[in-house]
Amino acid sequence: IWELKKDVYVVELDWYPDAPGEMVVLTCDTPEEDGITWTLDQSGEVLGSGKTLTIQVKEFGDAGQYTCHKGGEALSHSLLLLHKKEDGIWSTDVLKDQKEPKNKTFLRCEAKNYSGRFTCWWLTTISTDLTFSVKSSRGSSNPQGVTCGAVTLSAERVRGDNKEYEYSVECQEDSACPAAEERLPIEVMVDAIHKLKYENYTSSFFIRDIIKPDPPKNLQLKPLKNSRQVEVSWEYPDTWSTPHSYFSLTFCIQVQGKSKREKKDRIFTDKTSATVICRKNASFSVQAQDRYYSSSWSEWASVPCS
Amino acid sequence: VPGGSSPAWAQCQQLSQKLCTLAWSAHPLVGHMDLREEGDEETTNDVPHIQCGDGCDPQGLRDNSQFCLQRIRQGLIFYEKLLGSDIFTGEPSLLPDSPVGQLHASLLGLSQLLQPEGHHWETQQIPSPSPSQPWQRLLLRFKILRSLQAFVAVAARVFAHGAATLSP
């Protein structure tokens, strides 16, 4: 058993069919010695008496808010949560496996630039009695500070018969050094509590590996006189690191016909303009990637040819 | 470069960009193979990193690019020695068309651009001997290449910025 925060305790349960459970001794936080009784959750029924209460925790019903009382007055509370391990593996029932970029990916994180700011998100089908808390640092043995904001419900989607909820959090490295080569990874730790179930999820990454620029902005087409060709131009996204002479992007451009089956020629360029043949009903698209490190491509920015 | 002269920024830019391409073609499987394990915080200390105080940021380069260039050169020589060691030359043998050979030559080429003949900067010691098991060697190759990708990305940014803003 360990303390998650004041008056909240996590009982680690190594579960197998005939597991004996965990013996937990609760102590009433009071100088009083006599006339103390214990209750569980909202029930008025007395579970036991005395300054300590010993319980055998074997299933979720044994967890909950234990309160000690004297003369009808609550003296102290202890909320017991269960963290379940089965076959040597901690439970991951609360969050959905996003399976990208690999199996057992419960947290996904992205950064728009090298400023040390990043966003992580996760999915669940649970809609109520759910709380999250997030901690982050750079490195684990001698951690450097990362500050995370409040967790927010960022999206709701219907997936077949189920509703899926996306939660996200924004974090910022306290002393980011955008130009340096990262040596220690960022660690993100999410605590999830659903009813009386406690779970924790972690992710470890370098900012450079989670970079995904915003799409290029200001796409413009300028027809060239007496030609089927057009000059297309675009700009770095506002959110990308500066100066651009240092934090450079490379671009992938394509012209997509109306039919999805039509062959698309992709061209790669470091410039922010190109000359292409842009037929009527087609569209021109461009996406960006860090020029020197193969992290994710941005989403496409598109503009119709006509 | 030693003694304060300027490097051939444009040449360095071209070669460092080529290094980035080669480093990724040598080990493209980036997001799909998590090579970080327990204790990696210690093993990453073995390779030289371009750190915050090394003056490789745009402001540091404007003030005095020498600190940064020295750091980059140390790293290039370190990786050049690693790629020439039996970590890469031993079993399992690299494929004949492996980009590691080109990568090795380009590391050497760029380090020489930063130090013309006759000047010798001290460089870091080559790391401890290579592991004996082929599978360990393979894993170490991947780790070295991942680390090299990060190192040459910073070097390439430095030379791109230098070529754009510091060239005479």
Epitope: L40, D41, Q42, G48, E59, K195, L196 | -
Partner: nanobody, 126 residues
Framework: EVQLVESGGGLVQAGGSLRLSCASS????????RGWFRQAPGKEREFVAA??????TYSDSVKGRFTISRDIAKNTVFLQMNSLKSEDTAVYYC?????????????????????WGQGTQVTVSS
């Protein structure tokens, strides 16, 4: 994925006693409460008793006569029935709830339970 098996039913004379057992297997860690319900012919299934950790609750009709208890080590719940009456004749069902209610009285509702046993017949002859 929780299995429940009742035993201990039978024929008993009015005023007599019986002890019912309910053995649970499968993913028993997910259980918040266990209960006993009964169904007499032509009647609705009704609540008898429930237990969660050390908490117990009973229907008014059995209070003081029936006792629900739990053997933690054996994953078994018991219903000790004393002073049996002919109106106690019914099929007795064991149930397990994997939903959490902070108000323990919610476990006296039939729809709070997710898993049910096959039932055991109790007949009280007068």
């Amino acid at each position: 994925e929780v299995q429940l098996v009742e035993s201990g039913g039978g024929l008993v004379q009015a005023g007599g006693s019986l002890r019912l057992s309910c053995a649970s297997s499968g993913r028993t860690f997910s259980i918040y409460a266990r209960g006993w319900f009964r169904q007499a012919p032509g009647k609705e299934r009704e609540f008898v008793a429930a237990i969660r950790s050390g908490l117990t609750t009973y229907s008014d009709s059995v209070k003081g006569r029936f006792t629900i208890s739990r053997d933690i080590a054996k994953n078994t719940v018991f219903l000790q029935m004393n002073s049996l009456k002919s109106e106690d004749t019914a099929v007795y069902y064991c149930a397990a709830a994997v939903n959490y209610f902070t108000d323990f009285t919610d476990y006296s509702k039939r729809d709070s339970y997710d898993y049910w046993g096959q039932g055991t017949q109790v007949t009280v002859s007068s």
